[in-house]
Interface confidence: low
């Protein structure tokens, strides 16, 4: 009696169980009563990453330099190419289909976390006592100058964008 279900790594076709093609190979012809499944390896720029009955391999991803992409890991017959972003850029999505420049933190904000190839710069507002007067992708908020340690007094208060201005103490006669 013909089977209704097949073992792992097999598939049901024409009332019989045929072997699936291994990763890296595509199906050329189904098995018959007399012959095994015929599989053919994927070509140089293609892959299949599972046991399958696909008649065509998938094309490797192209890391398009126009989109800021570069090869992180070259594809094989069993794995897709992995793209990453060029220096100074990060992926716009988890699948990394294109890249954008890292964000700079504006004056008044400092870098909390420097960007990576997959994540953008994380900025944070400079808290009281700290400032940033630059637009930067790596500068943290800096502490206001301590006038006291220089035996000076604050002449102009600091903000989140400017340092304090120190000056000499008024000397009474």
């Amino acid at each position: 009696e013909p089977p209704t279900a097949c073992r792992e790594k097999q598939y049901l076709i024409n009332s019989q169980c045929c072997s699936l093609c291994q990763p890296g190979q595509k199906l050329v012809s189904d098995c018959t009563e007399f012959t095994e499944t015929e599989c053919l390896p994927c070509s140089e720029s293609e892959f299949l990453d599972t046991w399958n009955r696909e008649t065509r391999c998938h094309q490797h991803k192209y890391c398009d330099p126009n989109l800021g992409l570069q090869v992180q890991q070259k594809g094989t017959s069993e794995t897709d190419t992995i793209c990453t972003c060029e220096e100074g850029l990060h992926c716009t999505s988890e699948s990394c289909e294109s890249c954008v420049p890292h964000r700079s933190c504006l004056p008044g904000f400092g870098v909390k976390q420097i960007a990576t190839g997959v994540s953008d710069t994380i900025c944070e507002p400079c808290p009281v006592g700290f400032f940033s007067n630059v637009s930067s992708a790596f500068e943290k908020c800096r502490p206001w100058t301590s006038c006291e340690t220089k035996d000076l007094v604050v002449q102009q208060a600091g903000t989140n964008k400017t340092d304090v201005v120190c000056g000499p103490q008024d000397r009474q006669r």
Epitope: L40, P41, S43, E44, S45, E46, R56, C57, Q59, Q70, V71, Q72, Q73, K74, S77
Partner: antibody, heavy 115, light 112 residues
Framework: QVQVQESGPGLVKPSDTLSLTCTVS????????MSWIRQPPGKGLEWIGA???????YYASWAKSRVTISVDTSLNQVSLKLSSVTAADTAVYYC?????????WGQGTLVTVSS | DIQLTQSPSFLSASVGDRVTITCQAS??????LAWYQQKPGKPPKLLIF???NLASGVPSRFSGSGSGTEFTLTISSLQPEDFATYYC??????????FGQGFGGGTKVEIK
């Protein structure tokens, strides 16, 4: 800067071995296949062979018995050796990045086989 | 090795003409086909791979089509800088001992 440059002697004697070096910069040889192609004067392009990012070598059938392609990733270099040369091996020899998608080529180096 | 038959070998055309070059592979190479442009004294320049994908910086007047054994390169409106020799190149890979790779014989596009 991403580039590929071939170097080697411009003149080789018949029956000697032709040795060329391809020096790359701006990318890693472990991430790319590299191919050698040649072009006899006034003729078309002829694929010689390639070396994969993992080190596997692939040669055109005419070249199998005479060609060796190797890679030194630490020096960023791919080399081509063609033994028992004749006048028919006179050509511009190109090194290129890739296999079927040759996206980066050297300027080529002319090798003349003559006594 | 794989045989790639390119036609025509020579082609005379004028600026603004639509030009078509064909490449026939001796066996199925899926979409593993590239097109290159070569000018005298220069290395070839990648135009298209795989089969129909334009390489970086290539003008949109170039297009490619085909799969399996029949491929076409089309230049929709020939420009003065397009007069050159064009090559197809294709291959397949199954293992270090079973693969194919080759170039077509080239098509020289000349000014009429």
């Amino acid at each position: 800067q991403v580039q590929v440059q071939e170097s080697g002697p411009g003149l080789v004697k018949p029956s000697d071995t032709l040795s060329l070096t391809c020096t790359v910069s701006g990318f890693s040889l472990s991430s790319y296949d590299m191919s050698w192609i040649r072009q006899p004067p006034g003729k078309g392009l002829e694929w010689i062979g390639a070396i994969g990012g993992a080190g596997g070598t692939y040669y055109a059938s005419w070249a199998k018995s005479r060609v060796t392609i190797s890679v030194d990733t630490s020096l960023n270099q791919v080399s081509l050796k063609l033994s028992s040369v004749t006048a028919a091996d006179t050509a511009v020899y190109y090194c290129a990045r890739g296999w079927t998608r040759l996206d980066l080529w050297g300027q080529g180096t002319l090798v003349t086989v003559s006594s | 090795d794989i045989q790639l038959t390119q036609s025509p070998s020579f082609l005379s055309a004028s600026v603004g003409d639509r030009v078509t070059i064909t490449c026939q592979a001796s066996e199925d190479i899926s979409s593993n086909l590239a097109w290159y442009q070569q000018k005298p004294g220069k290395p070839p320049k990648l135009l298209i791979f795989p089969a129909s994908n334009l390489a970086s910086g290539v003008p949109s007047r170039f297009s490619g089509s085909g799969s399996g054994t029949e491929f076409t390169l089309t230049i929709s409106s020939l420009q003065p800088e397009d007069f050159a020799t064009y090559y197809c190149q294709g291959g397949y890979w199954t293992s270090t001992s079973n693969f194919g790779q080759g170039f077509g014989g080239g098509t020289k596009v000349e000014i009429k």
